[in-house]
């Protein structure tokens, strides 16, 4: 997290706020609930109380405005900037401007005025932007789901930096980001992208180039916000330039950030048992054509050029790749050897003489 | 219904730059996933260069540090700066919207020569 120069924050703990205006994009109910829940998300982990006025001079002012709107920080039209807000202070201080010239909804459609309010807050309270790819905080707008809204630590940690925690949180898990070089990290998912490799776990993934050591960190929903937050296995088929990702029962076949029509499926349409509840790890191999599925302690082998699943199968991990153990988090192939994660520990298995040869740390792939 | 089309392809010698566009008529193309294609002759068109809705990049490895995407969602547009060109970059260049299944351009002729 990061506050600003000569931490600006407010003196007193009650704060009040006004509505001056509305959006055509919204119900006026709509747009004083998103507010009213947006404040929520900051009184809930600090002593700060917010209060409603409808006329008169409130702490913190909202409005709406496109282009030259009154402070001499213009906005550009449709998307681009889609709103800012003061740091602490009087007049201006504290004040939220929403650039009408964007679809504010309630929905993902759009832009979600709630994320945005609630990101704006943040600096109306004092807290500037943060570098941390998975805080409200962060200057990049993701759509972060439907499922209830959960504070991030970080932007939790910044906060109470300022004004301290609150009395009781009511939502006390805020979710952290992975630290790479945690050395009990275990991984969701990993598959090769167009050359680079993609290593997802929990609602994130590293994105790792061959050419460099430092991966970067992005949520999985700023490159695919139509995907699940998180995901349980995916492969690559680079012949065809199309990854699988897997969640659950379902999959979806995606063109670099696009979702191929007819997608999510069921993944009994690759002609697994209904009983298969989730795909845990895949692999795809592009010499011969198969991918490997692995669920539990089995996997199946699908041909991807027939669209059948293999005779003989599923097997036992165990059987097939013996010493990895009863279960694969994350798979990926290289150079004749596949890397199996289990836990926080990877094998190097070499296709050739069909043995591990290397038993490593799973976070070595991020060169830690 | 997006339409493409793309300009500013040309012969440049190895080291030059160019700078493709790729102009949209229709609504949605804010709404979709601006890419880069090429295809060389002989070869299977390959991918170069995409940007999402929320502006992420992304590149094939051969370009990457070379070439740069952006785009301007207010005017149409989308944008493709090469630097650095080898001649194994000669090849017709493809404006895309939307990816595989979406809206493609006639293509731009870039020839780099050494």
């Known amino acids: 997290y990061n506050v600003f120069p000569r931490t600006l924050k407010w003196s007193k703990m009650n704060l009040t706020y006004r509505i001056v205006n509305y959006t055509p994009d919204m119900t006026h109910s709509e747009v004083e609930k998103a507010f009213k829940k947006a404040f929520k998300v900051w009184s809930d982990v600090t002593p700060l109380n917010f209060t409603r006025l409808h006329d008169g001079i409130a702490d913190i002012m909202i409005s709406f405005g496109i282009k030259e709107h009154g402070d001499f920080y213009p906005f550009d039209g449709p998307s681009g900037l889609l709103a800012h807000a003061f740091p602490p202070g009087p007049n201006y201080g504290g004040d939220a401007h929403f650039d009408d010239d964007e679809t504010w909804t309630s929905s993902s459609k759009g832009y979600n005025l709630f994320l945005v309010a609630a990101h704006e807050f943040g600096h109306s309270l004092g807290l500037d932007h943060s570098k941390d790819p998975g805080a409200l905080m962060f200057p990049i707008y993701t759509y972060t789901g439907k499922s209830h809204f959960m504070l991030p630590d970080d932007d939790v940690q910044g906060i109470q930096s300022l004004y301290g925690p609150g009395d009781e949180d009511p939502n006390p898990k805020h979710p952290k980001t992975p630290d790479k070089c945690d050395p009990s990290l275990s991984l969701d998912a990993i598959t090769s992208l167009r050359g680079e490799t993609m290593i997802f776990k929990d609602r994130f993934f590293w994105r790792l180039h061959p050419q460099q050591v430092d991966a970067e960190l992005f949520l999985t929903k700023s490159f695919w916000p139509e995907l699940p937050n998180r995901i349980d296995a995916a492969y690559e088929h680079p012949s065809h330039d199309l990854i699988f990702i897997f969640r659950g029962r379902k999959f979806w076949a995606l063109n670099g950030y696009d979702i191929l029509e007819g997608y999510p499926k069921k993944i009994s349409e690759l002609g697994l048992p209904k009983e298969v509840k989730k795909i845990s790890a895949a692999v795809h191999f592009e010499d011969t054509g198969k991918t490997l599925l692995f669920s539990g302690n089995q996997v199946w082998r699908y041909d991807d050029t027939n669209h059948i699943m293999d005779k003989d199968y599923p097997r036992l991990i165990e059987e097939d790749f013996p010493g990895i153990g009863d279960k694969v988090d994350a798979v990926y192939e290289k150079n004749g050897y596949i890397y199996f994660f289990n836990g926080p520990i990877q094998f190097e298995y070499s296709i050739w003489s069909n043995r591990i040869v290397r038993v490593m740390p799973a976070n070595s792939i991020l060169w830690c | 219904k997006v339409q493409l089309v793309e300009s500013g392809g040309g012969s440049v010698q190895a080291g030059g730059s160019l700078r493709l566009s790729c102009a949209a008529s229709g609504s949605t193309f804010s709404r979709r996933s601006m890419n880069w294609y090429r295809q060389a002759p002989g070869k299977q068109r390959e991918f170069v260069a995409g940007i999402s809705t929320g502006r992420i990049t992304n590149y094939a490895v051969s370009v990457k540090g070379r070439f740069t995407i952006s785009r301007d969602n207010a005017e149409g547009t989308g944008y493709l700066q090469m630097n650095s060109l080898k001649p194994e970059d000669t090849a017709v260049y493809y404006c895309?919207?939307?990816?595989?299944?979406?809206?493609w351009g006639l293509g731009t002729q870039v020839t780099v020569s050494s």
């Open positions: 895309n919207a939307g990816g595989l299944q979406g809206y």
